[in-house]
């Protein structure tokens, strides 16, 4: 799996979207998981309905929702009110039993907004990003990551 | 932008403990893993093990298990490791450490290091 | 535990040279996720440790084109192209991949 990078303001909302076969995971509950840094645990932050037939139904855990079109084969995720502890590596997964198919890596990364004035110290500007050699971008603001490539900001 | 400061060197005597902080500030605390690593005078580098201040999951050197206890107090972003019952060979100099990037865990942001010394 | 042996132990260069530095794993060092946590680092007298080097290959941010990594499986080498006077130092190697993360022992890089 790459790893996709979606960008979003702070104060703002990020969708994060994660396409997968609907028939491949016909019936099969989906997570959003925070991983503990690239080599840690992911860690459960919202899943969809426990009815898999009312997965379109948006659960929230806190600031983030999830929701999935199970025909169209997209799962959604809503990170509200983007907060620089909120920027890190997340997985969307397929859940069967007691395993997890990752369906996505994601990279989420939280920009300062232009507009504010106030001390960004956690925050970075894209500006001061490396920029990916040969990254496929995605604009929703969102780019796959290739292996070896590093966003790099100076202060995250 | 990224820092970590130590805290000050240690004179300590033998059957003593220290806690030694990890003070850090431009980032996030919680989003990156924290490593300490130990530095005898002439000799090469230990890690001593790593700690999520997000979760408190962490790793230990199963050698500093009973001598190292890593904690992490997010209100002040500041990490510790508290060493117990000290001897000669604990006397070191200790680095706090931290990930590169969420994508690159290579140490890329240490502190200063903190020199413990112990003696009589 | 891996064990990462480093060798040699001690390089003396001339500046301008090619200094080359060798690192033997005991063990295959591939994270369960895939990757190689091979990295290098270098630490002056009285400074802290510097990363050069992250998976097995990938140059940091501010490194030295120089400077570059190389290998797989057990045996890794980091490489530099035209010694200058502000390499000089002791480099390690470092394996992040399996609990106790384990650094080489050092090589000293000195003048000739």
């Known amino acids: 799996h790459n790893t996709t990078v979606f960008q979003g303001v702070a104060g703002q909302s990020l969708q994060v979207s994660c396409p997968y076969d609907s028939m491949k995971h016909w019936g099969r509950r989906k997570a959003w998981c925070r991983q503990l840094g690239e080599k840690g645990p992911c860690q459960r932050v919202v899943s969809t309905h426990n009815l898999w037939l009312l997965s379109f139904l948006r659960r929230w855990n806190g600031s983030t929702a999830i929701t999935d079109d199970t025909l169209g084969g997209t799962l959604t995720i809503t990170l509200r009110n983007l907060q620089p502890h909120d920027a890190g590596l997340y997985q969307c997964q397929s859940l069967h039993g007691s395993e997890a198919d990752t369906l996505r890596k994601v990279l989420v990364e939280v920009l300062a907004d232009p507009l504010d004035h106030r001390d960004a110290g956690d925050l970075w500007f894209p500006g001061e990003s490396e920029s990916f050699e040969d990254a496929h971008v995605e604009h929703s603001i969102s780019r796959s990551l290739l292996e070896g490539e590093i966003p790099f900001p100076p202060t995250s | 932008q990224v820092q970590l400061q130590q805290s000050g060197a240690e004179l300590v005597k033998p059957g003593a403990s220290v806690k030694m902080s990890c003070k850090t500030s431009g980032y996030p605390f919680s989003n990156f893993w924290i490593t300490w690593v130990k530095q005898r005078p002439g000799q090469g580098l230990v890690w001593i093990g790593d700690i999520y201040p997000g979760s408190d999951n962490s790793n230990y050197n199963e050698k500093f298990k009973t001598k190292a206890t890593l904690t992490v107090d997010t209100s002040s972003s500041t990490a510790y490791m508290h060493l117990s019952s000290l001897t000669s060979e604990d006397s070191a100099v200790y680095f706090c450490?931290?990930?590169?990037?969420?994508?690159?865990?290579?140490?890329?942001?240490w502190g200063q290091g903190t020199l413990v010394t112990v003696s009589t | 535990d891996v064990v990462m042996t480093q060798t040699p132990l001690s390089l003396p260069v001339s500046l301008g040279d090619q200094a080359s530095i060798s690192c033997r794993s005991s063990?295959?060092?591939?994270?369960?996720?895939?990757?190689?946590?091979l990295e290098w680092y270098l630490r002056k007298p009285g400074q802290s440790p510097k990363l050069l080097i992250y998976?097995?290959?990938n140059r940091f941010s501010g490194v030295p084109d120089r400077f570059s990594g190389s290998g797989s499986g057990t045996d890794f080498t980091l490489k530099i192209s035209r010694v200058e006077a502000e390499d000089l130092g002791v480099y390690y190697c470092f394996q992040g991949s399996h609990v106790p993360y384990t650094f080489g022992g050092g090589t000293e890089l000195e003048i000739k």
């Open positions: 998976k097995v290959s």
């Open positions: 063990q295959t060092i591939i994270h369960s996720n895939g990757n190689t946590y």
């Open positions: 450490a931290r990930e590169a990037y969420y994508t690159n865990p290579g140490f890329a942001y």
